[in-house]
């Protein structure tokens, strides 16, 4: 039978290219059976993950899965970095893989790099 443990479906080493100034939603897909767990987002600073306290978050419910969403409205250059979601379930802490946002600073619309250009040049962001 299917496990009733909470599972967080962020892929290992997932990455996103996003533009400063745009809105962006970072999703943490959560599978649970009965009671929805308490979920939080944190941002990695070296080996420490710093909890994001004062950020807009929301839940989106779908048939087989729920999404805990961290809102960036808008994306800022210092949003660049790696994030992780965590769930408290039966006094256990379940951590997701980290996901990395590569923020490209806003240029004029005509100079904006394509998604593929951004994907191929993450070192520009450091």
């Amino acid at each position: 039978k299917e496990s009733c443990d909470v599972q967080l479906y962020i892929k290992r080493q997932s990455e996103h290219s996003i533009l400063a100034g745009d809105p962006f939603e970072l999703e943490c897909p959560v599978k649970y059976c009965a009671n929805r767990p308490h979920v939080t987002w944190c941002k990695l600073n070296g080996t420490t993950c710093v909890k994001l306290e004062d950020r807009q978050t929301s839940w989106k419910e779908e048939k087989n899965i729920s999404f805990f969403i961290l809102h960036f409205e808008p994306v800022l250059p210092n949003d660049n970095g790696s994030y992780r979601c965590s769930a408290n379930f039966q006094s256990n802490l379940i951590e997701s893989h980290s996901t990395t946002l590569y923020v490209t600073d806003v240029k004029s619309a005509s100079e904006r790099p394509s998604k593929d250009e951004m994907a191929s040049r993450p070192w520009l962001l450091y």
């Epitope: 892929k11 997932s14 996103h16 593929d116 994907a119």
Partner: antibody
Framework: QVQLVQSGAEVKKPGSSVKVSCKAS????????MYWVRQAPGQGLEWIGR????????RYAQKFQGRATITADESTSTAYMELSSLRSEDTAVYYC????????????WGQGTLVTVSS | DIQMTQSPSSLSASVGDRVTITCRSS???????????LNWLQQKPGKAPKRLIY???KLDSGVPSRFSGSGSGTDFTLTISSLQPEDFATYYC?????????FGQGTKLEIK
């Protein structure tokens, strides 16, 4: 079970481009990463790059940066690898592969596509 | 880039032999999640590679139990406890910890 089927062999002129396709079945590719590896005749394996089909983010080995383009079409469960400015040293079998993005619980390779670059 | 070095590059053995192939990485493959992303592939002539082992020691489904993997940090081994005729092939290690992914140069296992 997860399966990958690649497009057929290609013969190309130096300086031209080739685009190889790789169609997945038995898996939702949003939950995977798809990657490309090549093998020159009698040689070892060389990683070209990978794509996250969920968001289109592609990552490349530096050697292929700017010359390889990996894309994915979620609606057809197909990944593509285009290699431009072909030279004779690009003659190789090109493999696509797919693996589970969460737990790495599966890793399946396509049958390979022979690309021959010759004038 | 992480360099992956396999030894030996070729090996002659007989059916029933116990065989060990080693793989050394130029830096630790231990990821921040505490796992080492070291895989072993088998490739037969004219065929696509097939993953045998992942996360150092986990066997892929359908892989016979005579195959085993071990190691940590930078040193890893693939062991075949009792060679069968279908095991004669080329074996590659490769790392999935850092980008770019990198492969060992391969070990060709031949019949003595």
């Amino acid at each position: 079970q997860v399966q990958l089927v690649q497009s057929g062999a290609e013969v190309k002129k130096p300086g031209s481009s080739v685009k190889v396709s790789c169609k997945a079945s038995g898996v939702n590719i949003k939950d995977t990463y798809m990657y490309w590896v090549r093998q020159a005749p009698g040689q070892g394996l060389e990683w070209i790059g990978r794509i996250d089909p969920a968001n289109g983010y592609a990552r490349y080995a530096q050697k292929f940066q700017g010359r390889a383009t990996i894309t994915a079409d979620e609606s057809t469960s197909t990944a593509y690898m285009e290699l431009s400015s072909l030279r004779s040293e690009d003659t190789a079998v090109y493999y696509c592969a797919v693996y589970d993005g969460y737990y790495e619980s599966f890793d399946v390779w396509g049958q390979g596509t022979l690309v021959t670059v010759s004038s | 880039d992480i360099q992956m070095t396999q030894s030996p590059s070729s090996l002659s053995a007989s059916v029933g032999d116990r065989v060990t192939i080693t793989c050394r990485s130029s830096q630790s493959l231990l990821d921040s999640d505490g796992k080492s992303y070291l895989n072993w592939l088998q490739q037969k002539p004219g065929k696509a590679p097939k993953r045998l082992i992942y996360l150092v020691s986990k066997l892929d489904s359908g892989v016979p139990s005579r195959f085993s993997g071990s190691g940590s940090g930078t040193d890893f081994t693939l062991t075949i406890s009792s060679l069968q005729p279908e095991d004669f092939a080329t074996y590659y290690c490769w790392q999935g910890t850092l980008f770019p992914r990198t492969f060992g140069q391969g070990t060709k296992l031949e019949i003595k």
